[in-house]
């Protein structure tokens, strides 16, 4: 199926506070992961801050005509193309409990389609041929999803489903920590 670009603009997906749910407590290895409510120093941003736009998962809006052989849609359709980076975690505060930010390398995320929508289009054909009706599947929204070793690169795992495994080489310490980990960044960029 051919596509002809008509125009495009961009929308940045910057997650709101609380957009991602907290993991169940048992996934945190019986530890409180330095959240602000556990006391300690007031939160601040220890990590190097970059321009948010450099890391946003963007929805590029493309207006195109749908073509099928010699036939073309009577009206253009608007579709999203997912583009840009995912992170940093300062935009995803509720994910921090799962993140082991002190590691030099961590989960890799991609900006990919999240939801789709079906749209019926009417195709006009040359030579007096009767118009055809076609249903097309269009990207409706984008999301940061984690690459996972249990899937192919094309099949991605939702950001909110990452579970922390117990780590080797350390014992659970169920006591309050400083607020600093709340400010961690997952600077995963592509």
């Amino acid at each position: 199926q051919g596509w002809q670009a008509f125009k495009n603009d961009a929308t940045e997906i910057i997650p709101e506070l609380g957009e991602y749910p907290e993991p169940p407590p048992e996934l945190e290895n019986n530890k409180t992961m330095n959240r602000a409510e556990n006391g300690g120093r007031p939160p601040h941003h220890p990590f190097e801050t970059k321009d948010v736009s450099e890391y946003s998962c963007r929805e590029l809006h493309f207006t195109r005509y749908v073509t099928d052989g010699p036939c073309r849609s009577a009206k253009p359709v608007t579709e999203l193309v997912c583009s840009g980076q995912c992170g940093p975690a300062r935009l995803l505060p509720n994910a921090i409990g799962r993140g082991k930010w002190w590691r030099p390398s961590g989960p890799d995320f991609r900006c990919i389609p999240d939801r789709y929508r079906a749209q019926r289009v009417q195709l006009l054909c040359p030579g007096g041929e009767a118009p055809r009706a076609r249903k097309v599947r269009l990207v409706a929204s984008c999301k940061c999803k984690r690459l996972t070793r249990f899937h192919n690169q094309s099949e991605l795992k939702d950001f909110g489903t990452e579970a922390a495994r117990p780590q080797k080489g350390r014992k659970p310490r169920p006591r309050a920590r400083s607020a600093k980990a709340n400010q961690a960044e997952l600077e995963n960029a592509y």
Epitope: P107, L147, R170, E187
Partner: antibody, heavy 119, light 110 residues
Amino acid sequence: EVQLVESGGGLVQPGRSLRLSCAASGFTFDDYALHWVRQAPGKGLEWVSGIGWDDDMIDYADSVKGRFTISRDNAKNSLYLQMNSLRVEDTALYYCAGNNRGYGGLDVWGQGTTVTVSS
Amino acid sequence: QSVLTQPPSASGTPGQRVTISCSGSSSNIGTNTVNWYQQLPGTAPKLLIYSNNQRPSGVPDRFSGSKSGTSASLAISGLQSEDEADYYCAAWDDRLDEYVFGGGTKLTVL
């Protein structure tokens, strides 16, 4: 100027202990996660251990687990590596390194201290 | 034997573009971000690329990183004599639960 300076290296017999230190300056120490990375003579880099803001955030390489202990003293701007039951294969240049960008690589390095384990 | 596989050596002439590969598996590069380090002779390593393709401030844009599947690459364009060094890739390995380095690639500028 951001600086990490390692000390405590030396010649030690197999089975003995050694404690490495890393003194930091030029940055807010407890904003950084800190790591030990070693390099055997003529060989590549090998990550040894890492610690976050406190002892609740620690990782070790399998090769040193149970023998080495990483710790930090934020009041003294210092990182430590207690090395017990040393083996000949632990002979290496030990680097102290840090990262203050979550999952963003080790962006600060010391010049290293040499540990030689030999009988 | 390193968990991440790099060619032991690479070479190029000044001005040329050179690429260094790093091959891993689904438990390291396939899942986690890749970092690259440069170690000039007799000096400590230096972070060159983090999070697959991001350059820390001060690193020239001649250096670029990319990742696809379980492999990563470091590209150096406009090769200069001062680029002669050892280059290491690294990533967290979820199976080993540790930070793993490639064996290193010695880059020679002819």
